[in-house]
């Protein structure tokens, strides 16, 4: 058993049929010695008396808010949550496996630049009685500070018969050094509580591996005289790290016909313009990637050829 | 050229060669992003290779103030990786494929380090400790980890030379 926060405790249980469970001793936080009784949740049934209460925690029915009273007065509370371990593996019932980039990916994180700011998100089908708490650091043995905000519900989607909820959190490294080469990964830890079930999820990454620039901005076409060619120009996204002479991007320019089956013409360039042939009903798209480190491409920015 | 004492390197040549190094490092291990090395408990390897750190003066401001600190740091790292790529981790069994870019990568590391320190000029003699002997089954993972770290190292070096070529060239 360990303390998650004041008056909230997590009991770690090996979860299998007829498991013995864990013996837990609760102590009433009071100077009083006599006349103390214990109840669980809203029930008025007295579970025991005295300053301490010893319970055998085996299942969710044994978890909940234990309260000690004297007379009609509440003295203190202890909320017990359960953390299940099945076949040596901690349960992951609360969050959905996103399966990208690999199985058992519950947390996904992205950064728009090298400033040390990043966003993580996760999915669940649970809509109520759900709380999250997020902590982060750079390195684990001698951790350096990363500050995370509160997790918020950022999207709701319908997937077949189910509703899916996306939560996200923004974090910022306290003393980020955008130009340095990271040697210690960022660690992100999410505590999830659904009713009386506790679970924790972790992710470990270098900012450089989760970079995904915003799409190029101000995408414009300029027809070239007496030609089917156009000059496409664009600018670095506002959110990308500066100076651009140091934090450089490379770009992919694509000409795509109306039909998905039509051949795509692609040009790669380090410049912020390119000359391409504009076919009727086609569109021109541009996306960006770090020039020197192959992290994710941005989403496409597009304009129609006409 | 980055001669100890302070004259400038051939920024544009360094930019071109460092960008080539980035390409080679990724082509030597293109699928690197799909394997989570931290699951392999690779702290020792990542701790054992060079890193361009915050105080090394490789940020735009540091380069403007005095690029020599950063260039020396990059030079040290290039020599270090060149020695690793020339060791039995890469030359031993299992043999690399004949068209593997590792050979080119090795030569380019040497080429860039020589651009930074031409004959007759010396920062300090580069020493690296004796390498632990490795067995074929260990080498595949070590190669993977070294290339993964090298990709991050040369990315920073390439940014430095690109910025230098754009803003510090005579």
């Amino acid at each position: 058993i360990w303390e998650l926060k004041k008056d909230v405790y997590v009991v770690e249980l090996d979860w299998y049929p007829d498991a013995p469970g864990e013996m837990v001793v609760l102590t009433c936080d009071t100077p009083e010695e006599d006349g103390i009784t214990w109840t669980l949740d809203q029930s008025s049934e007295v579970l025991g008396s005295g300053k301490t209460l010893t319970i055998q925690v085996k299942e969710f029915g044994d978890a909940g808010q234990y309260t000690c009273h004297k007379g009609g007065e509440v003295l203190s509370h202890s909320l017990l949550l359960l953390h299940k371990k099945e076949d040596g593996i901690w349960s992951t019932d609360i969050l959905k496996d996103q399966k990208e980039p690999k199985n058992k990916t519950f947390l996904r994180c992205e950064a728009k630049n090298y400033s040390g700011r990043f966003t993580c998100w996760w999915l669940t089908t649970i809509s109520t009685d759900l709380t999250f708490s997020v902590k982060s650091s750079r390195g684990s043995s001698d951790p350096q500070g990363v500050t995370c905000g509160a997790a918020t519900l950022s999207a709701e989607r319908v997937r077949g018969d189910n509703k899916e909820y996306e939560y996200s959190v923004e974090c910022q490294e306290d003393s980020a050094c955008p130009a340095a080469e990271e040697s210690l990964p960022i660690e992100v830890m999410v505590d999830a509580v659904h009713k009386l079930k506790y679970e924790n999820y972790t992710s470990s990454f270098f900012i450089r591996d989760i970079i995904k620039p915003d799409p190029p901005k101000n995408l414009q076409l300029k027809p070239l005289k007496n030609s089917r060619q156009v000059e496409v120009s664009w600018e670095y996204p506002d959110t990308w790290s500066t100076p651009h002479s140091y934090f450089s991007l490379t770009f992919c320019v694509q000409v795509q016909g109306k039909s998905k089956r039509e051949k795509k013409d692609r040009v790669f360039t380090d410049k912020t313009s390119a000359t391409v042939i504009c076919r009727k009903n086609a569109s021109i798209s541009v996306r960006a990637q770090d020039r020197y480190y192959s992290s994710s491409w941005s989403e496409w920015a597009s304009v129609p050829c006409s | 050229r980055a001669v100890p004492g302070g004259s400038s390197p051939a920024w544009t040549q360094c930019q071109q060669l460092s960008q080539k190094l980035c390409t080679l490092a990724w082509s030597a291990h293109p699928l690197v992003g799909h394997m989570d090395l931290r699951e392999e408990g690779d702290e020792e390897t990542t701790n054992d290779v060079p890193h361009i750190q915050c105080g090394d003066g490789c940020d735009p401001q540091g380069l403007r103030d005095n690029s020599q600190f950063c260039l020396q740091r990059i030079h040290q790292g290039l020599i270090f990786y060149e020695k690793l790529l020339g060791s039995d981790i890469f030359t031993g069994e299992p043999s690399l494929l004949p068209d593997s870019p590792v050979g080119q990568l090795h030569a380019s590391l040497l080429g860039l380090s020589q651009l930074l320190q031409p004959e007759g000029h010396h920062w300090e003699t580069q020493q690296i400790p004796s390498l632990s002997p490795s067995q074929p089954w260990q080498r595949l993972l070590l190669r993977f980890k070294i290339l993964r770290s090298l990709q991050a190292f040369v990315a920073v070096a390439a940014r430095v030379f690109a910025h230098g070529a754009a803003t510090l060239s005579p």
């Epitope: - | 054992d48 632990s132 067995q135």
Partner: antibody, heavy 120, light 113 residues
């Protein structure tokens, strides 16, 4: 917890072969190299040799012609053999481990040592 | 072989006073690529096996009191004890693991005055 324990005869006759065993527990021998070090009575420490995680060995050049280090992974045991011993080989013999990495590490855990006396 | 020269060989100290031991290898133990010095410090208490105090010249092993500190780089290293306690008596050794064969200093015997 991590343990290394040396064992073997405490007395060996001159010109014979000294044989010691180091039994380890609490760590994976595929992640650690195991070294032998000795200390003559009242003197300093001398590195004898190492067996690497991959099974290859390196020895101190001053002892190389007489030393063999091997291991039995199924038993989590390492052995040291030192042939043609003389009184100068009388020492406390230690085994110690270092974490496998690109470069050899420092010894973080040692056995308690076993005294071997060479005498007729 | 890298020769490790330790001084002094004997060090009598009054409890509560500081102590300092020097170790000078015959060649540099600094790998400038990764900025590590391949040097460790050990304490061998009477009748015991050596125990690790400091690795990579300046990193304290977990569980080692913070009165022990290591410093130096290249060919000049120092182990300092800020305030010697009775339990610190024993022989202190430096070890280089930069090149084969590993070599130790001759040892410094710290005793209480």
């Amino acid at each position: 917890q991590v343990q290394l324990q040396e064992s073997g005869p405490g007395l060996v006759k001159p010109s014979e072969t000294l044989s010691l065993t180091c039994t380890v527990s609490g760590f994976s021998i595929s992640s650690y190299n195991v070294h032998w070090i000795r200390q003559p009575p009242g003197k300093g420490l001398e590195w004898i040799g190492v067996i690497w995680t991959g099974g290859s060995t390196d020895y101190n050049p001053s002892l190389k012609s007489r030393v063999t280090i091997s291991r039995d992974t199924s038993k989590n045991q390492f052995s040291l053999k030192l042939s043609s011993v003389t009184a100068a080989d009388t020492a406390v013999y230690y085994c110690a481990r270092d974490k496998y990495g690109l470069f050899p590490g420092y010894f973080d855990y040692w056995g308690q040592g076993t005294l071997v006396t060479v005498s007729s | 072989d890298i020769v490790m020269t330790q001084t002094p060989l004997s060090l009598p100290v009054t409890p509560g006073e500081p102590a300092s031991i020097s170790c000078k290898p015959s060649q540099s133990l600094l790998s400038s690529g990764n900025r590590k010095n391949y040097l460790a410090w050990y304490l061998q208490k009477p009748g015991q096996s050596p125990q690790l105090l400091i690795y990579y010249a300046s990193t304290r092993q977990s569980g080692v009191p913070d009165r022990f500190s290591g410093s130096g780089s290249g060919t000049d290293f120092t182990l300092k004890i800020s305030r010697v306690e009775a339990e610190d008596v024993g022989v202190y050794y430096c070890l280089q693991h930069f090149n084969y064969p590993w070599t130790f200093g001759q040892g410094t015997k710290l005793e209480i005055k």
